[in-house]
Each structure stands twice: as C-alpha cells, then as structure tokens.
C-alpha cells in the first residue's frame, strides 16, 4: 500500500516562549518524516498536562536535540 503523501504535522502553532525546565513534565521529539517535513518538539507541562509545541530552531531546543543525538549514538547497537 503506497504511503499517504498528506502532510500531517502534530503542531499547528509553535511557541517561541522559553520553557522553564521546572514546569516541564516531559518533552517528546518527533523527527521529520514523510508525514511531516519538520522535527516537532512537544512539551507537556506539569500543570494540567497542557501540551505546547516548541520552536526546534531555538537555541535551547537545538542544544537538547544535540544532546539527544549524542545519547542515541552512544546507545545504538
């Protein structure tokens, strides 16, 4: 079955506000794929579990992605 070419990104709008690590429950990293051409960073906040999309171009998120890929290369079989 051929894969759907429809763009299906999770994030509709992106927050440029810096996120305080203390208020974060978790960050989910969704790499670019055939469904969405850009990497998406979804922050789940501790209060009320609110989800917020972060800017992957921000310095903080670039640092984070660098650290994650470093970890990945360390742990990949």
């Amino acid at each position: 079955v051929p894969l759907s070419r429809t763009v299906r990104c999770t994030c509709i709008s992106i927050s440029n506000q810096p996120v305080n690590p203390r208020s974060l429950e978790k960050l989910e990293i969704i790499p670019a794929s055939q469904f969405c051409p850009r990497v998406e960073i979804i922050a789940t906040m501790k209060k009320k579990g609110e989800k917020r999309c972060l800017n992957p171009e921000s310095k903080a998120i670039k640092n984070l992605l660098k650290a994650v890929s470093k970890e990945r290369s360390k742990r990949s079989p």
């Epitope: 690590p21 203390r22 969704i30 903080a60």
Partner: antibody
C-alpha cells in the same frame, strides 16, 4: 571523578561586585541543573537559585531575585553566581550543587522522550567563603 | 524563619534509633518529594535520602526516610558516633517556586 569546585570567595568590601565560579568535571555539565546554596554563619542552608545550562534558564528564590545573577558557560562547564553590590548580610559559605538531570527514554524509537528528574542535590562543591566587611 | 520545620536538636546513645521530623505544607511536602542532607562538621552537605525514601549508593541502610501528607521523617537506626552532624530536610515549594529547607537538626551522639 564527578566533582564541583567553587572559587572566587574572600573578603570583600560592601558595595563591591563579586563573581563566584563553580567548575564541573566528570559528568555532562549541560545534562544537569546547577544550584547555588548558601549558609550564613550560625544559620541553616538557603537555596539561592539554579540554572539549567542546556536551556540557559535560571530560577531564583524570591529573596534573591534581582540581587544576584546566575549564569553558566557550557563550553567550559562552569556556573557562576554574581553580585553587582554586596551587603554585609551576604556573608556566608557558598556552595554549588548538581540537581535536576535530563533523562532520555525511548531513544531508539521514532519518538524519544526527555524528562528532567529532580532527585536532590547529589554532588556538592567544597564551598567558598564570602566575607563582606569594610 | 524556615519554610520547613525541624526540631533544632536531637540526641541518642550509640545503637539507639533516632527520628527527625520535618513539617511542611500542601505547597511543598504535600505535593513534592522530600530530600534529606547530612552536614558533618567542617564538610559540605551530602545527599542522604531523595524522593522521600530512596538512598543514594554509598549511604548505609541505617538511614531511612518516609513521607506522610505534609510531613517527612528521617530515621537513623543503630546510631553511631560518626552520625553526629546537622541534618536538613528539603523540598520544592510550588507557591514560592523554589527549593525550601528546614532549619536543620543538630544530632548529638551521647
């Protein structure tokens, strides 16, 4: 080995500026938060604030907001605590400590997750004494 | 005045069991975990208990922690002379947006 080393303390006159350094080694500096704590003579421990080098974001105790600045330089794995104008009441032993850790799970899946676990200050520096006196 | 309340002093004889309490409120201990630190004379503090009841590696199992509601407790069983130190409880406070400490408990081994 994993360690934090503070420096920059000493006897300083009131109104002068000062910067304390906290040099980290033996661990990935940007994967943790670094906290500053002080102990005035004869008193208990006081939390001043913390910085998460990866995000470059600092949190401060209300008491110290606007009085001090916490910063970090990832390239040399060092955190700083800075005053522009010291007061006699700033006399204390100052410690830096390691706190929140970035943990990455589901690394080998297509959706890695990052959590920050604040499991207490597990590594402390030896402390540096600041005496503010004319 | 500290946000968390601890007794200023505690004492016991070698081999005894000593409990140090730490009382807080719904914005700190009630909704966050408790950590305990030991400060030996002339040394930097060290983490003794994290996440209410977890011991870091290298901490003897004579030290244990617990949390109930808005209070935490540190228990030292089989007290030893080298346990003579200051003990501090700590938690995060959601209202103050910062870490808070107890005033410290000076433990004397008689």
């Amino acid at each position: 080995q994993v360690q934090l080393v503070e420096s920059g303390g000493g006897v300083v006159q009131p109104g002068r500026s000062l910067r304390l350094s906290c040099a980290a080694s033996g661990f990935t500096f940007s994967s943790f938060s670094i906290t500053w704590i002080r102990q005035p003579p004869g008193k208990g421990l006081e939390w001043i604030g913390e910085i998460t080098p990866m995000f470059g974001i600092a949190n401060y105790a209300q008491k110290f907001q606007g009085q001090v600045t916490i910063s970090a330089d990832k390239s040399i794995s060092t955190a700083y605590l800075q005053w522009s104008s010291l007061k006699a009441s700033d006399t204390a032993m100052y410690y830096c400590a390691r706190d929140g850790r970035f943990d990455v799970s589901d690394l080998l899946t297509d959706k890695p997750k990052v959590t920050i676990n604040y499991n207490g200050m597990d590594v402390w520096g030896q402390g540096t004494l600041v005496t503010v006196s004319s | 005045q500290s946000v968390l309340t601890q007794p200023p002093s505690a004492s016991g004889t070698p081999g005894q069991r000593v409990t140090i309490s730490c009382s807080g409120s719904s914005s700190n201990i009630g909704s966050n975990t408790v950590n305990w630190y030991q400060r030996l004379p002339g040394a930097a503090p060290q983490l003794l208990i994290y996440n209410n009841d977890q011991r870091p590696s290298g901490i003897p199992d004579r030290f244990s922690g617990s949390k109930s509601g808005t209070s935490g407790s540190l228990v030292i069983s089989g007290l030893q002379s080298e346990d003579e130190a200051d003990y501090y409880c700590a938690s995060w406070d959601d209202s103050l947006n910062g870490r808070v400490f107890g005033g410290g408990t000076k433990l004397t081994v008689l």
